[in-house]
Structures are given as structure tokens and as C-alpha cells.
Interface confidence: medium
Amino acid sequence: AWELTILHTNDVHSRLEQTSEDSSKCVNASRCMGGVARLFTKVQQIRRAEPNVLLLDAGDQYQGTIWFTVYKGAEVAHFMNALRYDAMALGNHEFDNGVEGLIEPLLKEAKFPILSANIKAKGPLASQISGLYLPYKVLPVGDEVVGIVGYTSKETPFLSNPGTNLVFEDEITALQPEVDKLKTLNVNKIIALGHSGFEMDKLIAQKVRGVDVVVGGHSNTFLYTGNPPSKEVPAGKYPFIVTSDDGRKVPVVQAYAFGKYLGYLKIEFDERGNVISSHGNPILLNSSIPEDPSIKADINKWRIKLDNYSTQELGKTIVYLDGSSQSCRFRECNMGNLICDAMINNNLRHTDEMFWNHVSMCILNGGGIRSPIDERNNGTITWENLAAVLPFGGTFDLVQLKGSTLKKAFEHSVHRYGQSTGEFLQVGGIHVVYDLSRKPGDRVVKLDVLCTKCRVPSYDPLKMDEVYKVILPNFLANGGDGFQMIKDELLRHDSGDQDINVVSTYISKMKVIYPAVEGRIKFSTGSH
């Protein structure tokens, strides 16, 4: 028997520095977790103790903090090189700055293979990107070889900016021939490493013949065997065992997100490459694990110029941006309109001639807006200003919901109106009318939504049985502020870009902004 240790990360999202327990900015260092310096300490410890170790990343290193805003992926290449990753799969967020923003900082600079079998380049891009990412890679590990085959969410064109010269194929259809090729090369230990979410990971384990282990990402799935060490609630045991169509037991793993855990899976293979046993658990990277001093020093060096970024002008406002709780928790506020407009603008993807855009709606809990911005400071808006408005380090995500769920959400928005509670929704691409004289749960008297399958966008009544795409904060997607119906009834959830980054990009693009209160939210006469 031959034993392999798989160390894995996914959805790190630019958390190069240690973070608080909820993966936001580290405040009290003695309670902080993760970060590449701490990760390196643990990885090196395991490399010294065990003979056959692979360090893998399942995508979405890009996007999430000011590190990515400034360094655009160069920080990913540098620190992944320093940690000596063995392979990485492409995630959807790796395309956030277009193909060029992937090729230059990461693909050309990475000293490890970057993989995806289901992304095919065409046209002029084919020769430009040739060899910079691969469908699979055979890695020598000790006296053996291990094949790693990559995959990426086929939804990427709707979630990011891969352009028109990359085709995202069905994962299972694309993976099978590559695995077959590895078999003909006498590679009998094969890991599928990819970024399509836990459901697809399980399908790959079930359907792709010859895959021994699946290491996934995208859904931020936390798996754990035994008592979990922090706040995350396990979605299943680690590893999650799937019985394949040809009768094999295939371990599937994922390691939550944000570099908080290091996935740790031990696999025993027989001489024919069959998995005999698999066991392990994610390792919580808490403060009991010291940060490696050399990597920490390197982090501090790269930081020098980040601090200055926060105070630089992104653009100007010529109006007061009312982000006060007195406004945003009671009525339409122009800060809410600005943020929602930025959220929609960030998700413009013209992927189908029938649709002007794939999504037109935004909802945003008023309690998530934490500060106004005064235009009398020469109109200047800085990252620092936006960090006061959106201090929680969240993301603006894409969900699919039925109309009936949206209706429930808007009823919840005003079910206890008047108490300055955070669930009052700010909107974009939605016109809502409330009648507060009616009883809670029956206060939404009009709910019109902007069409997407139209050449001239207009507002139509919400249809209860129709499925709609909506951009919203991850906080709401996870059921925050009492929006349990969103969490329980959502049909799809894809994590998006860092909230501040979305708004800062929009302001930089617009240069001068003047959001108004324009009747998106109304109260019927006599009730307000």
C-alpha cells in the first residue's frame, strides 16, 4: 500500500493576511486565524512529518480584499509560489479582470500547474493562452505519479468576465476523456481538482470513471468528522464518500473558504491505484499555529503600499450620499440606490441576444449600510469612506429565487416597520409599494420588477412561479436579518465580488456620481 497526503484550500478570496474568526479584518491578533504565513507553518510541518504530500488549491484565490484590488493577482502568484503549491484549478473569480488579468499576473508567473479540462480556448486567444493552463498534470510524488485533472464551473460566463474566446464545457463530458488519457499513460491514481460546487463534485465522483478523489471548491462547503472546532456547521462528514456508478467508494472533500482551514486528507492506495482507505479532517488555522516569520515579513513588505491606497480618491459625488440609519432603515435612500446600481453594473454580462442582461434586480438590507458620505469634502470618495459604509467585508452574490420567495422577503422587509431594524430592503430594478395600514405579512401591495428578456427594459408585475436572478449581499443569501426564506428557498447561490470593490469600481468608472431618491420604494397614501 502507498499513502498520499492531500493538503487543500479553496475559495481563499484574497485572505493573504490573517483574519478574524468570521474571515473579516483581523482586529485582535491573539484570536485571528488563517493567512498565508500561518498556512505555510502548518504545510511545512506536515511536509517534514509525512513522505508523500501534495498541496492543492481548488480555485477562487482572486477577489475579496484590498490585496486583490491593488495587486490584481500578482500577490496570488507570489505567495502561492512561496508556499510551493503543487497545482491549482481555475475558479470563476480568476476571470474577474478578464483573460488578460489571469494570463499576465497569474498564469505567466505561477511556478505550479494551473488546470481546467473543461475550458477550451478558441480564435486568437487559443495560441496566446496555449500551455499556460492545462487540462491535467502528472505529478511525481515520492516513487509514484499522481494525475491531477482540473475543472471550472460552466456558469463562469454568468459569474465573471472570461470573454468570448473561452468555451466552458460540461464538466463531466470534458473530464472523462482526460481521465481516460491519463489511464493510457499508466497513471492509476487520479485526483479531480476543481471549482464547480459540492453538488457537481459529488456528480463527478459518481460519473467520471477513473477518478479516485475529488477536491472541490466554489460552494464554500465545510465537511467535518467529529466535533467541529469553530463556528462552521458541517454539511457532512470529511471525507464525504460517494459510491461511483462502477461501484467504487470515492472521497469528496472541500475546506470551507477564506484560508481558515487547511484540508487534510490521507489516502491509502493499493498497487493498482485503488483507494483502500481515506480519512482526515480540515485543520483550523487558529492562533495556536504560529505565523511563519519569513512569509509574515514578506506580507508586511507587500503591505506598505496597500495602506496608502485607502486614502486615494476613487471618484467624486456632487450630492450627499445618505447612508444614515434614519433613512436607509425607513425609506428609499440614495446610498442604497448607489450600491444597488453598482451591484447590477458589476454583473452586466451580455451572453445571450434575447436578454439585455442576465440579471436586473438587487436587494440590500438597509442595516448593512453603516455610514453616509458627505459631499462637502470636495466631493472626494475614498476606499476608506466606502469601508465605513460597508465595513463587514462581505460579497455581493448572485442567487436564483422564485417570485414567491421574493414576495416573502419584501413582506419581511416591513413586518415590524418603524423600529429602525436592519431588514428594511433597499432595491434596484424593483418598484415596491407598501401599505403599512395592513397587517404584517400582507403589506406589499405592488411589486414590479425590471424585465431581462427584453431590448427595452421596463417594469412588469412579479410572477410568483417565475424564477428570477437577484444580486444581494452574502449576508442575506445566508439568511441574515431574518431572511430565512431566502436561505431555505434559494435555487442557486454563487458567491460574488467583494462589496467595497464593487462600489469602488463603479465610482471609478462613473467618475462623478449623483444618485437620487427616485420612487423605487413607495408607501401607499394614508399609511406613511
Partner: antibody, heavy 120, light 111 residues
Framework: QVQLVQSGAEVEKPGASVKVSCKAS????????ITWVRQAPGQGLEWMGD????????NYNEKFKTRVTITADKSTSTAYMELSSLRSEDTAVYYC???????????????WGQGTLVTV | AIQLTQSPSSLSASVGDRVTITCRAS??????????MHWYQQKPGQAPRLLIY???NLESGVPSRFSGSGSGTDFTFTISSLEAEDAATYYC?????????FGQGTKVEIK
Amino acid sequence: QVQLVQSGAEVEKPGASVKVSCKASGYTFTSYWITWVRQAPGQGLEWMGDIYPGSGNTNYNEKFKTRVTITADKSTSTAYMELSSLRSEDTAVYYCAKEGGLTTEDYALDYWGQGTLVTV
Amino acid sequence: AIQLTQSPSSLSASVGDRVTITCRASKQVSTSGYSYMHWYQQKPGQAPRLLIYLASNLESGVPSRFSGSGSGTDFTFTISSLEAEDAATYYCQHSRELPFTFGQGTKVEIK
């Protein structure tokens, strides 16, 4: 090999503006900071500011903040430094330089352009 | 801004001499085990050339007679055995915080 090639000498009148270019080759332009440094005749080196071409992020020396604009064009791997409201004391050689980056982010200036003499 | 003071401002030495230049910072430029001090050589009519980075690391292609040391606020640049081609002005520069500043320079002449 890494090269930074700057535009030619300029003679400008007081109050005018000057824009100096710096074309980079031989490395990934978007992944390293470009710094601008000037040197008046017979004087020392003065750090003016820098740009990260990957994001367009800039930092300026307070002394020049209101008059200098540093930009970068990723498509041509060219950085620019524009200085406005020129006065006689701006007569100097203006250098662009590449900062160390991916191997050690120490911000030492490891490659320099040949310099552009601006006479006001 | 951090001020850097070089001394001496000029010196004259013979070929084969050991030459030492010091650079004092008005504030610590060391942290996390790194000292953000660099040394450059500039010959008349030429652009500066990086010799030493992070206080003591020799840039590739630079002769080993050049060296640097120091931490905190006090740094030293040494030419162990002066050669005729070393006649130039030498500058220290810090990159600990913005703005990055240079010392005023030390002119080295050959006797």
C-alpha cells in the same frame, strides 16, 4: 532582458505641462511598480511617485501631488509622468525605474530608464 | 517623511582603499527582520544603478567588493577595495513607508 526606454528631451515654457513616457519590455509590465525620480542639475535624486500598472494605483510625493499625474497604458506597456504648471526649478532629468516585485517586494529600483531632460 | 542623512558628502580615496559611507534615517526603517534600505551608484551622465537592496543583499551582477550592513536607523555601505571605475556618487534610499526618500548622495573621487 528588462528595458525601460524613455521619450526624448523636452523644452517647455513656464506654466506649461510636460508628459514623459517610459516604455517597458522584457518583463510582466502589470506586475511591478514603476517609479518616477527626478534629478535637478548637480543635485540629488528625488522620489516623485509611482504606479502599479496592473490596477492603475498611484502614490505621490506630497511635494508634487497637485501637479503630477502618473498613468500607465497596459496595452503598450508604457508608463507616463505628466507635470503641470512648470517652473524653472523643474528643470531636471526625469527617470522612470522598475521596482523589485514578485521575488522580493522590497521596492528597490532594479532597472532604470535612460532619463529624459526637461528644460523649463 | 523619513529623512536620510549621508556622510560624508564627498570623499577622496586611492585605488585599493577601503571606503565606508554611512546613512542615518530619522526613523526606524527596519521591521519584520527586514531593513528597507537600498544603495545606488550613479556615474556622471548615467542613470543610477542598484547595488545593494534590503540593507545587505548584493544585486545580481554587482561585484562582491560592494557590501552593505546595518539595521534600525544606522546603515553602512562599504567598498572593500576601491577601483578606478568606482568613482561615482552613491545614494541610499529607504522604502519603509511612503514617500520613499533618498539620501543627498556621497561623491567618491579617486586620488
